[in-house]
């Protein structure tokens, strides 16, 4: 239903009184500078707020920090600046919060110019206490926690040293010099690139990729002529310079760099780039930039080995090197991704895939919306979503698309309805089925957040004027109620809720300005009394994901299985609760040719689902043939799509062919790898 269509709206009774009793204001008595907020742990209610104020003087910058702590989801804050000895904290490093519920926090302090090293403040009790530690180096990056052990930290120094701590920053050891980039892998492994001659920049393309599995006791060189590397899912990727020219290619490893395979992807030149858009343990989405400053490239999806790639989407918008892409993983429904393409006329259009990049389509026009001026045909157009690119272009888009794994099917985004993205003021749209259908949810741009696993959606209008009204919906955005949370409007700066969308608390941040002073202020609203009771079995209904045609036997089948979910009824005003777990029932589907991708040396002709042998190998296929590993060239033409669980049905088994015969040159043996020890 259209927004505010009252006859369909089940109003929440007495909500003003209920919310007024649960609205908590906190005024921060410091000068308005910048503010950063971090949640410490999951379901702990602990929030750290760091306010910083800079005064640039002629010869130096005078800075002041204040640190506040809440342990009730932001309802009350305590000034704990004394715990960090009133030290100025470097905001560019942020607050390094430990993984999971470790309760660890590291703050990096500003130190005077002549000091031997930096200074950190460490807490391992959810910021109740801090220990000051002077570092034997000046940090270049934020401290990085090992995902497996939060006591293990790594950092790069301003002198390109790689430093490791095994006791949560108490003692540090430099394990390697001349390091450009370092990352934690699995099992406390560290991967890093080193330069031999000049510097990271000068040696780009001549770097070495190293690995240590014992925190720096021993090392193994696992790659040479490296330009850069990245980790995604269980894959380790490196872009490696070619011998003969200035191009580089992607190589992939699934065994921590012990063995490498060349990826069957186009090589790129100096001005081009590769980017891992998304990766999981099954597969990877890889963007390969087009030659020239086009602002677009091609998305490829990998097989289960990360070696063979299928072209997924042409003209994928990704502004030059490390710029902006709208690529978004819709986490509320398996297999769904949204991104933008740059069409021939230079307009930007949104595309969506429901099957992990197999097919892309335009977004269906919302039923309650008209086509805008960009549409040639006023009856036929699509929804186009504003994401990172629009935000970077300073369009009136305060937020990127939002979805949460525990709010099944819900996607919220700014958009316009026409033939392409419009520069006009956008509205907010919602999908309750993972992007198949859309409805206009709110007029004009808004900030929005999901609470209680989708039981409540909260929104605040994006305005240059001070605001004092918040909107909320208990029926997935069909109907909205407004609540005035303060008599005195504030200049709004942000909406904060605990990551994971399980909380029922929302914090509205902003500042008040009077003649001489301005102060930070937060309002935390607890919606627990709006959702008075816990949800029961009768509050949920059963929903089949990806359903498009119930008469089709395979309705709902995506990647070889379908899933039915228990979903909260829109009319049920109740609490899912913090312990809510998505209930789903999978069902295996029969295999069809759609469940298979074409292996190396095979392709699908237009409008055909069969894989046909390529008559000749050319371009990057021939290179793969020449430099790839021998065992990857023996194939029956089909490989199951990564993550596909289908059984029975079509089994495309046929004669295994050896494609080596098509290679016109001998294989080059991989370079020998060497090992070193400290």
């Amino acid at each position: 239903s259209a927004p505010g269509e009252d006859e369909e709206c089940g109003r929440v009774r007495d909500f003003v009184a209920k919310l007024a009793n649960n609205t908590h204001q906190h005024v921060f008595d410091d000068l308005r500078g910048s503010v950063s907020l971090s949640w410490v742990g999951d379901s702990t209610g602990v929030i750290l707020v760091l306010t910083t104020f800079h005064v640039p003087l002629v010869i130096m910058t005078f800075g002041q920090s204040k640190l506040y702590r809440s342990e009730d989801y932001g309802k009350n804050f305590k000034d704990i600046t004394d715990l960090i000895n009133n030290t100025f904290i470097r905001t560019e490093f942020g607050m390094a919060i430990g993984p999971e519920n470790s309760g660890k926090v590291v703050l990096t302090a500003e130190v005077s110019g002549g000091s031997r090293g930096g200074r950190i403040f460490r807490s391992s009790d959810f910021a109740k206490n801090f220990v000051q530690t002077d570092l034997p180096f000046h940090p270049l990056t934020q401290m990085m926690y090992s995902p497996q052990n939060s006591d293990y930290l790594l950092a790069l120094s301003t002198e390109n040293g790689l430093w490791v701590s095994k006791n949560f920053g108490g003692k540090w050891e430099e394990i390697h010099k001349a390091v450009c980039l370092a990352k934690w892998g699995s099992d406390n492994t560290i991967f890093f690139t080193t330069y031999a001659n000049g510097s990271c920049k000068a040696d780009l393309g001549a770097l070495e990729l190293w690995r240590t599995s014992d925190l720096g006791k021993s090392f193994k060189t696992i790659g040479v002529k490296i330009y850069s590397f990245g980790l995604g899912g269980r894959f380790l990727f490196a872009s490696v310079m070619a011998d003969k020219d200035t191009t580089r290619r992607i190589h992939v490893s699934t065994d921590q760099g012990d063995t490498w395979s060349m990826a069957q992807l186009p090589s790129v030149g100096q001005e081009q780039f590769y980017s891992i858009l998304a990766a999981n343990d099954d597969m990877v989405f890889m963007h390969v930039d087009e030659p020239g400053d086009t602002g677009f490239g091609t998305i490829f999806t990998s097989d289960d080995r990360g070696i063979v790639y299928s072209k997924s989407l042409d003209r994928h918008l990704y502004t030059t090197t490390g710029g902006e892409t709208d690529f978004t993983n819709v986490t509320s429904l398996r297999g769904v991704y949204i991104t933008s393409v740059l069409s021939e006329d230079n307009s930007i259009q949104t595309m969506i895939t429901f099957d992990q990049g197999g097919r892309w389509t335009h977004l269906r026009k919302p039923e309650n919306s008209e086509c805008d001026a960009t549409a040639k045909n006023k009856n036929e157009c699509s929804l186009h979503i504003h994401a990172s690119y629009s935000i970077s272009q300073k369009l009136n888009v305060p937020m990127a698309p939002l979805s949460e794994p525990n709010a099944v099917g819900i996607v919220i985004a700014h958009g316009s309805v026409g033939d392409a993205i419009s520069v006009m003021v956008p509205d907010v749209y919602i999908s309750d089925d993972g992007g198949y259908s859309w409805t206009k949810m709110l007029e004009g741009p808004h900030y929005y957040t999901i609470l209680d696993s989708g039981g409540i959606i909260v929104a605040i209008e994006h305005s240059s004027r001070p605001i004092n009204v918040i909107k909320f919906s208990t029926d997935e955005g069909q109907c909205w109620q407004t609540y005035t949370f303060t008599r005195d409007p504030i200049y709004f700066t942000g909406l904060a809720s605990e990551p994971g969308a399980r909380s029922m608390n929302i914090s509205i941040w902003g500042f008040t300005e009077s003649f001489l002073t301005s102060q930070w202020v937060s309002y935390t609203i607890d919606f627990k009394d709006i959702l008075e009771r816990n949800c029961e079995e009768k509050d949920y209904t059963i929903w089949l994901a990806h359903s498009t045609d119930p008469e089709d036997y395979e309705d709902g089948c995506i990647l070889g299985y379908k899933e039915a979910f228990l979903r909260l009824r829109k009319s049920s005003v109740c609490q899912n609760g913090r312990d809510y777990v998505v209930t789903k029932q999978p069902s295996i589907c029969l295999c069809s040719l759609e469940d298979f991708l074409c292996d190396f040396g095979y392709y699908r002709p237009e409008n055909d689902s069969k894989c046909v042998e390529q008559p000749e190998l050319k371009g990057h296929d021939l290179e793969f043939c020449l430099y790839g590993r021998e065992e990857h060239l023996t194939t029956n033409g089909y490989r199951k799509i990564p993550g596909d669980k289908c059984q029975g049905g079509v089994n495309p088994v046929r004669e295994v062919k050896d494609l080596k015969k098509k290679c016109t040159s001998n294989f080059l043996s991989p370079e020998k790898q060497n090992s070193k020890s400290n």
């Epitope: 259908s437 009768k538 209904t541 089949l544 359903s547 829109k570 009319s571 069902s587």
Partner: antibody, heavy 124, light 106 residues
Amino acid sequence: QVQLVQSGAEVKKPGSSVKVSCKASGGTFRNYAISWVRQAPGQGLEWMGGIIPIGGWANYAQKFQGRVTITADESTSTAYMELSSLRSEDTAVYYCARQGRKTGYYYYYGMDVWGQGTTVTVSS
Amino acid sequence: DIQMTQSPSTLSASVGDRVTITCRASQSISSWLAWYQQKPGKAPKLLIYKASSLESGVPSRFSGSGSGTEFTLTISSLQPDDFATYYCQQADGHITFGGGTKVEIK
């Protein structure tokens, strides 16, 4: 054309159980929920519960909770309703019905195909 | 559970009459309401789903309206075949039926 064919009439003693079957033909049984509705002589319709064949996910009306069991066998496109601890008030015509579906939601669109009904008489 | 109250319980009308049956839900059910027609000894037949959508094969003289808690079924011009009992059914919670409205010949 989809059809639901139910098992024949049953006469049962109080305290016993009855199991009624409902076989679907001519459609995609696995993609729709099956509801069971009963109608006592001269009375209105009463929903007992339903099942979706995916994983045999059943849900029941409060009134029948603990006394009714609904199951489905995807391989034979058959749904079953078993009612235990029968009493004379359970004398009724029992219908199975397919829940129409236009979107992913199983129970929102009314029951578009009905079985012919099975008369269950509970008498000592 | 949501209660459905149908009125009237009996309605006498003549062929050609415009007939309206109402159904009230004890709480808002959005548009999740269906209407059925049942003749003696037969299974019910779906007429309307989602409050106002006509099931395929059902004559256009049948129409449904309403949302929230108030719903109506209208037969624009009563035909001889329309004398039967009509039930409303809500689907926004555990399914419940109204008590029925018997349309008889005046």
